[in-house]
């Protein structure tokens, strides 16, 4: 028989909710990104001591990761949305090398890595259709990306788990921004 | 191994109720969303309402969201103690019946059958006028 509603005091129910608009889906997006980045992160600290590690330069130098500059319109002085909107795209567009990357980092949490990724590809696509703009995206060249992954995995193991960890921070700190700015828009 | 398991469907009379239970085990990603789905005879795989789910306290952990057609009838909601997600259904109609399923998925804030990745079995919902 059924179970009447609020027997279980344990039970978490949300209000009823009017429909999502594009900006809002976009946001929770982003923070349900972060929070899978979270876990990644978690595993990553608790297996290595790269979290606390000053020798990041040493790997930061052969990685290409996207990050926010002035000339991006993301920040509040000189914010620009379409500009800011474009390099945002084209930001996510470039991380998919490198969480691709990622897939075979982790043992314990090899759906986490996965789901991280598949959930920005939704993200992607969430902001592709709110971008005027489209043509000045540029998707990253699949040969290039197949030759940088190459050299990533052909890395010794101190270097592969340092890259591990900045491609979580990289992209941590990028979404951060990217969300920031797309609450300007 | 990701499996989920409804439980829960029946007869019912037009303006009735019924709680359907989704037990969800083996999952190892977070977060999660949860969906329940429905399908009538001839007709597509359509969404209800889906739930967040999350291992560290966000402010999205527990976030809903319903179809048009359920909102103010329908309330999602889970026990994480049993691994299990609720859909309280009330104020049934014919054109509620269905088979009704529960899908997970790590992609976030996808409302459409083909986004989700692990699905039960389904359960019978049929409401008599």
């Known amino acids: 028989a059924p179970v009447p509603p609020g027997e279980d005091s344990k039970d978490v129910a949300a209000p009823h909710r009017q429909p999502l608009t594009s900006s809002e889906r976009i946001d929770k997006q982003i923070r349900y990104i972060l929070d899978g980045i979270s876990a990644l992160r978690k595993e990553t600290c608790n297996k290595s001591n790269m979290c606390e590690s000053s020798k990041e330069a040493l790997a930061e130098n052969n990685l290409n990761l996207p990050k926010m500059a002035e000339k991006d319109g993301c920040f509040q002085s000189g914010f620009n949305e379409e500009t800011c909107l474009v390099k945002i795209i084209t930001g996510l567009l470039e991380f998919e090398v490198y969480l691709e990357y990622l897939q075979n980092r982790f043992e314990s949490s090899e759906e986490q890595a996965r789901a991280v990724q598949m959930s920005t590809k939704v993200l992607i696509q969430f902001l592709q259709k709110k971008a005027k703009n489209l043509d000045a995206i540029t998707t990253p060249d699949p040969t290039t990306n197949a030759s940088l992954l190459t050299k990533l995995q052909a890395q010794n193991q101190w270097l592969q788990d340092m890259t591990t960890h900045l491609i979580l921070r990289s992209f941590k700190e990028f979404l951060q921004s990217s969300l920031r700015a797309l609450r300007q828009m | 191994q990701v499996k989920l398991e409804e439980s829960g469907g029946g007869l019912v009379q037009a303006g009735g109720s019924l709680r359907l239970s989704c037990v969800v085990s083996?999952?190892?990603?977070?977060?999660?969303?949860i969906a329940w789905f429905r399908q009538a005879p001839g007709k597509e795989r359509e969404f209800v309402t889906t739930?967040?789910?999350?291992?560290?306290?966000?402010?999205?952990?527990?976030?809903?969201y319903y179809a048009d057609s359920v909102r103010g009838r329908f309330t999602i909601s889970r026990n994480d103690a049993k691994n299990t997600v609720f859909l309280q259904m009330s104020s049934l109609k014919p054109e509620d019946t269905a088979v009704y399923y529960c899908?997970?998925?790590?992609?976030?804030?996808?409302?459409?059958?083909?986004?989700?990745?692990?699905w039960g079995q389904g359960t019978q919902v049929t409401v008599s006028s």
């Open positions: 083996g999952r190892t990603f977070s977060p999660y969303t």
């Open positions: 899908a997970l998925t790590g992609k976030g804030y996808v409302f459409t059958p083909n986004e989700y990745d692990y």
């Open positions: 739930i967040i789910g999350s291992d560290r306290s966000t402010d999205l952990d527990g976030d809903t």
